[in-house]
């Protein structure tokens, strides 16, 4: 199809080489309820669409995304050619940063309902650049945590070094929906609830004498509980003796509950004590068996191919540790009688 009639938007993604970060493009077509596709004035860069197109409109929620190759080749369907780009309804998610993401991206509705709709499309010219020598040492992260039940704030990474007074007007989106009343470089959250978790996008306009473009950053916001003040506790084994049959295989499970920690480095391991000696046992990898906002239960098994007489003289010790401290539980094997 002819893309010369598409409205055009220029975007800049300046990514940090130090952190993983994502990016999104919205298909900013006009809302179908407000007009029949493109039959309304285009938005100037200073205007903000009332909210994103097609959101909440089932029949029009699907759009087609293409990339325009720089060599003039025909448009390429994003889904076929770019595994690191994911389409979700009207949004295109870039999972990895890199200058190779620069280019022209075109979206249009899948359902073309009338001859007028053919020209209903948006062309987004995306420029991707690595951040130059950390222009600001303490720029906000693209991953931000909010502590449940307390106050918090979400900062726009590309503007976090500017004071509120200097900051340009910012347009914020949460999970693809415009937050029309939030216009500063920092959103204040009066009290953090779980619904504050999500993907936030902040946009502002930058201009030079020739043209203007939208600078965009994406922030993944996670709601968390406060770091635990407790060392982990061992849920299993509970008993310090275990009846076993000689010559038979045996698996002993150690399950431990670790309270939430923002920087989480859980340790769960088995070691064996035999008279004055003790050594760590090479056992299968630990696995998380239950994870909630407040804590995580991790399990690690020790496997004996067959129980020997020597094993009855040993103590099998499960050792668990977090940043607060450690806990151990030892198990002595006892031969089953009869």
């Amino acid at each position: 199809f002819n893309i010369s009639g598409c409205s055009t938007k220029k975007l800049l993604w300046t990514y940090s080489t130090r952190s993983e970060e994502e990016f999104v493009l919205f298909c900013d077509l006009p809302e179908p309820q407000k007009s029949h596709f493109c039959h309304r004035n285009r938005l100037s860069p200073k205007q903000v669409p009332e909210h994103l197109p097609f959101m909440g409109s089932n029949d029009l929620s699907d759009v087609q995304w293409y990339q325009q190759p720089s060599n003039g080749d025909p448009l390429e369907d994003i889904r076929k050619s770019y595994p690191h780009i994911i389409q979700d309804k009207c949004t295109l998610h870039f999972l990895t940063p890199g200058v190779n993401n620069s280019g022209s991206y075109i979206c249009r509705p899948k359902m073309i309902k009338s001859p007028y709709d053919v020209a209903c499309c948006v062309k987004m010219i995306l420029e991707v650049k690595p951040q130059t020598n950390a222009s600001c040492e303490y720029s906000a992260s693209h991953k931000q945590d909010l502590l449940l039940g307390s106050t918090g704030s979400i900062s726009c990474p590309s503007l976090s070094c500017q004071s509120d007074a200097q900051s340009p007007a910012v347009t914020w989106y949460k999970n693809g929906k415009l937050l029309s009343v939030e216009r500063s470089n920092r959103i204040v959250v009066d009290e953090v609830y779980d619904y504050h978790q999500g993907t936030y996008v902040c946009d502002y306009t930058q201009s030079d004498t020739v043209s203007s473009w939208t600078v965009r950053a994406v922030v993944q916001v996670r709601t968390i509980v406060g770091d635990t003040k407790l060392k982990p506790d061992i849920l299993d084994p509970v008993e310090d003796t275990l009846e076993v049959e000689l010559g038979k295989p045996l698996t002993i499970s150690c399950k431990a509950r670790f309270g939430f920690e923002r920087v989480f480095n859980p340790v769960i391991k088995w070691y064996i004590k035999d008279s004055d000696l003790e050594w760590e046992v090479s056992v299968p990898e630990a696995k998380s068996i239950k994870s909630t906002l407040k804590d995580e239960i991790i399990e690690r098994n020790i496997i004996l191919e067959k129980v020997t007489q020597r094993d009855l003289r040993r103590k099998f010790v499960c050792f668990v540790q977090n940043s607060i401290g450690n806990t151990t539980q030892s198990v002595q094997l006892k031969e089953k009688r009869g």
Epitope: H51, G56, T151, S180, V181, I187, D190, E191, Y193
Partner: antibody, heavy 121, light 111 residues
Amino acid sequence: EVQLEESGGGLVQPGGSLRLSCAASGFSFNNNYYMCWVRQAPGKGLEWVACIYTGSTGSTYYANWAKGRFTISKDLSKTTLYLQMNSLRAEDTATYFCARDDKVEHGYGLWGQGTLVTVSS
Amino acid sequence: DIQMTQSPSSLSASVGDRVTITCQASESIDNWLAWYQQKPGQAPKLLIYSASNLASGVPSRFSGSGSGTDFTLTISSLQPEDFATYYCQSTFYGVNPVPNAFGQGTKVVIK
């Protein structure tokens, strides 16, 4: 008993100022509420004016038409809410209600009985 | 600011009738919507919060539904004490649960 009581209403000339108060009793502002002002012109509907968060952020929120002329504030020690109204116009004539959000049932679960403000020369 | 549009502005009904009032938000507010009842000379009373939850002490003949931009308040069988004015309200502002803009109201009168 949990209640809100507005005061400070009365007759004021156009261009004049007035400060409304809302005394809260039976609960503490420390529990972090949105305390708000809503007005109702005679025979008309409810109109949101402004809100303030009584928690540490002290965030304030205003209807677009109220920005610049009206200021909401609070005194935690007196558990009192205020609305400073400047450059008053005839169209500001209304009963002004003080209301508190309900932390569970999102919305205004508690209302005062209102105070009448008349702007007239 | 979000605009809330209610319809109809007034309706006449009889005791026992099923009454439906609609409210439309100018942008999606998910389910952050409250409904109030106001009788002459009184402060409003919260009926429904979070679009469909009944506030404490409110009779079960009142119900709310909807999400996004379109919402409905239904009175399944109108009682004499239900003749009043009803308002919808957005209860979210940016990222905070601040009750704010009201609809213009629907007056329910006796037929």
